[in-house]
Amino acid sequence: FSGSEATAAILSRAPWSLQSVNPGLKTNSSKEPKFTKCRSPERETFSCHWTDEVHHGTKNLGPIQLFYTRRNTQEWTQEWKECPDYVSAGENSCYFNSSFTSIWIPYCIKLTSNGGTVDEKCFSVDEIVQPDPPIALNWTLLNVSLTGIHADIQVRWEAPRNADIQKGWMVLEYELQYKEVNETKWKMMDPILTTSVPVYSLKVDKEYEVRVRSKQRNSGNYGEFSEVLYVTLPQMSQFTCEEDFY
């Protein structure tokens, strides 16, 4: 789970803050439901997910409910409100649409069962940003070495559709990884802010896999990788002039 932890019990003491949790205040058995992840794909909505192993076993804790509170100006709201939408983000989840979401206030959420709190977290939306995967990956050949053994390619992609890049609401940085198809370890390139990057010195007789993921610059975490782009470089005659491939 990404974001700072907090205990709701002491929120009223410092209404404009996110309190750090005191580890001694509560214990959480691994069998109890726990938050696994909260994620905002585009800074305008977010969802939170939890485990629910207990309900598949013999011990029934009763229905799991999520409650949330937002920092209201001058005070945290004293009332906790129940999840506005248990359906849209899938099983064991709560979805907060754009009406409920602002990057300018902290949130606290708690899971309850039979009236008791079993897990709680606090965070601001920017801490949980994980963009959707980049889309529309493609590549073009840039250059082939005089020997015909190596080639350089340019890989291009597009930002996820729901990321408001044009207005600057999201500034994404991208990480490209590539490897030969039969290898297990991915080579990582340095993060970049553009949606294209050259990849140098690939072997022409090999097939490569390329993938890209993104994160919001300065906050949040990397999102899921794009679909894999397969790059097959055609065998070139070692006598072919380099100029032919510009």
Partner: antibody, heavy 115, light 108 residues
């Protein structure tokens, strides 16, 4: 009682620098999200910058008009908020208010940028 | 950036009268993130109403707020002498925090 007292304002030439301070008391400063808001003479309010608590990684945010020129920072051991203003322009002339996440406001300090 | 437009720019009224101040946003703002401030000459702004309709502590109940979407209203049911001031709306929903240009309520 929440108290916020700004200092460091004054007259500065265009292109110059100034550092504003805000001494905070009456609340747990280290837990607080703090903002600077300014008001040009006879004009409305303009949000300038925000810095969050350590629990929120001291994340900082800036208005486009000051990005790259102003830096918001804090010293939790001294209960003090800062605004370092570089490459000042005449349009930065304003009263600068220190605010507790725009809930509680100091009385402000006047910054005049003029040659 | 969400732009907030306040109207009228100036409202000339007598004590005891009702004042209605308008704030219009260029795109929808959830009511949770819309506040009103009062500012008197030479003073810092003071939070008046938070989340569209909730009175901040110490604010008399002659002040009230309403609205949703792009249109919000601050109402002062009966103006007292101390209410003559400038009023600002403020949002912090989808863009960077922004303030309206202000409405000055002056004595007629």
């Amino acid at each position: 009682e929440v108290q916020l007292v700004e200092s460091g304002g004054g007259l500065v030439k265009p292109g110059g620098s100034l550092r504003l301070s805000c001494a905070a008391s009456g609340f747990t400063f280290s837990d607080a999200w703090m903002d600077w808001v300014r008001q040009a003479p006879g004009k409305g309010l303009e949000w300038v910058a925000e810095i969050r608590s350590k629990a929120n990684y001291h994340a900082t945010y800036y208005a486009e008009s000051v990005k790259g020129r102003f830096t918001i920072s804090r010293d939790d051991s001294k209960n003090t908020l800062y605004l370092q203003m570089n490459s000042l322009k005449t349009e930065d002339t304003a009263v600068y208010y220190c605010t507790l996440i725009r809930d509680y406001w100091g009385q402000g300090t006047l910054v005049t940028v003029s040659s | 950036e969400i732009v907030l437009t306040q109207s009228p720019g100036t409202l000339s009224l007598s004590p005891g009268e009702r004042a209605t101040l308008s704030c219009t946003a260029t795109s929808s703002v959830s009511s949770w993130y819309l506040h009103w401030y009062q500012q008197k000459p030479g003073q810092a702004p003071r939070l008046l109403i938070y989340s569209t309709s909730n009175l901040a502590s110490g604010i008399p109940d002659r002040f009230s707020g309403s609205g949703s979407g792009t249109d919000f209203t601050l109402t002062i049911s009966r103006l007292e002498p101390e209410d003559f001031a400038v009023y600002y709306c403020h949002q912090y929903h989808r863009s960077t925090p922004t303030f309206g240009g202000g409405t000055k309520v002056e004595i007629k």
